[in-house]
């Protein structure tokens, strides 16, 4: 969570912004909020990137106002229109790069001052695990898979029975490119489980941990799953 | 349940003063700004003054610039409209609404009638 | 000031019709423009906001559309409850003004 000020005269604008995350390839959204001004038309939204000469996107005057806009960021911005009204200056952008990331600015004016804060937008994979009982290994097995990743995450099996053991030694985890190049599709395999436990394949890179849980008894087989992003203000 | 209720609306003599309220519940009144509408008898809707969520943003039509104030409490929930100097056109129904996109919430109305 | 002129003033019309009232700006004002509907004796209602986007819990026949100077609210088909008079309203500056008004009477 960043705040940041502003002052033109003695009105201070607050404009507050989300450290946030996008997913590669798919729609992202970097988060901004300030008090709104009644009056629409005052109202100007510049968002700027760190080291890119020209505006990510410029909305004024009740519309974009794109003459301005650098062309990497072409056809991919949108503010939410119709949201400005409350005060929402966040940016909607398409189809997430990898070269997105880095430090962007939201810049607000209103007809009683200025205000802008920073915030990091980090870009990546990161994808839910789907846990499986795999009855073609040999022994009793769980496969736990996630198809996007990016950068490489670490995995780490744990067990509600076994609590604190080691599983290194008992899984074996493969990272498999993904045909774009960049992503990686993750599995890993947990060899000789015990039914009536609950096991857990966790997933994680610096940008997001995922979770997937199974619980596996003779009458069922329950899974769960979560994503959580981190350092997200 | 989102709601928003007005108060304060009475007859009044011209040049005399009224204060009207407008408690807010149900949703977190400290992050929305509000409108005060008025409808004067079988007359359309017209804007009287707005105040955004801290209350750093107050505009007023221009019928009442000078003689209304509209002020807030977030922390008891409660829009004002302290109305000065009143005027026979000022006989409306006064209406409380929430900014949002669009005014989204309204209540229900207090009259308030001004002659001698 | 920006003015908001309704046509028609009043509108006769029946359960089931398609109908349309419009909305003019005195100037542009982007798609700052709702919709409202208000019956006797009772609060206005939001039905459209931004004019095109349906409030939520209003039915689907209500839509708007526009944007610039001129805006349309249609009903697609009339229902007994929708007898009422019509509002628009800009946002885009102060102060905040509304059209006239729409009476919509059973024919």
């Known amino acids: 969570l960043i705040i940041g000020f502003g002052i033109s005269g003695k009105h201070f604008i607050t404009v507050t912004t989300f450290t946030s995350a996008g997913n590669i390839g798919e729609d992202g959204t970097l988060s901004c909020t300030f008090e709104p001004d009644i009056k629409l038309n005052g109202i100007v939204i510049q968002w700027l990137k760190e080291g890119i000469k020209g505006l990510v996107h410029e909305f004024k005057e009740g519309k974009d106002d794109l003459s301005q806009q650098h062309e990497m960021f072409r056809g991919r911005t949108a503010v939410f229109a119709d949201q400005v009204v409350v005060g929402n200056a966040s940016l909607r952008l398409k189809n997430v790069q990898l070269t997105d990331a880095g430090t962007y600015t939201c810049y607000i004016r209103t007809s009683k001052g200025k205000g802008n804060a920073n915030l990091e937008y980090k870009t990546g994979a990161f994808s839910m695990p789907e846990i499986n009982v795999d009855y073609n290994a040999s022994s009793e097995s769980l496969r736990c898979e996630a198809p996007r990743w990016f950068p490489q995450p670490t995995v780490a099996w744990a067990s509600q029975v076994d609590q604190g053991a080691n599983f290194s030694e008992v899984s074996n985890t493969s990272f498999e490119l993904n045909s774009e190049n960049v992503t990686m599709k993750v599995v890993s395999v947990l060899y000789n489980v015990t039914i009536n436990n609950t096991y857990s394949c966790m997933i994680e890179n610096d940008i997001a941990k995922a979770t997937g849980d199974i619980k596996v008894t003779d009458s069922e087989v329950k899974r769960r799953s979560q994503l959580q992003l981190l350092n997200s203000g | 349940e989102v709601q928003l209720l007005e108060s304060g609306g009475g007859l009044v003599q011209p040049g005399g003063s009224l204060r009207l309220s407008c408690a807010a519940s149900?949703?977190?009144?400290?992050?929305?700004?509000m409108h005060w509408v008025r409808q004067a008898p079988g007359k359309g809707l017209e804007w009287v003054a707005s105040i955004s969520s801290s209350s750093g943003y107050i505009y007023y039509a221009d019928s009442v610039k000078g003689r209304f104030t509209i002020s807030r409490d977030n922390s008891k929930n409660t829009l004002y409209l302290q109305m000065n100097s009143l005027r026979a056109e000022d006989t409306a129904v006064y209406y409380c609404?929430?900014?949002?996109?669009?005014?989204?919430?309204w209540g229900q109305g207090t009259t308030v009638t001004v002659s001698s | 000031d920006i003015q908001m002129t309704q046509s028609p003033s009043s509108l006769s019309a029946s359960v089931g019709d398609r109908v349309t009232i419009t909305c003019r700006a005195s100037q542009s004002i982007s798609s700052y423009l709702n919709w409202y509907q208000q019956k006797p004796g009772k609060a206005p209602k939001l039905l459209i906001y931004a004019a095109s986007n349906l409030q939520s819990g209003v039915p689907s026949r209500f839509s708007g559309s526009g944007s610039g100077t001129d805006f349309t609210l249609t009903i697609s088909s009339l229902q007994p409850e929708d007898f009422a008079t019509y509002y628009c309203?800009?946002?885009?500056?102060?102060?905040?003004?509304f059209g006239q008004g729409t009476k919509l009477e059973i024919k």
């Open positions: 149900g949703f977190t009144f400290s992050s929305y700004g």
């Open positions: 609404a929430r900014a949002s996109s669009g005014m989204d919430v």
């Open positions: 309203q800009q946002y885009y500056t102060t102060p905040l003004t």
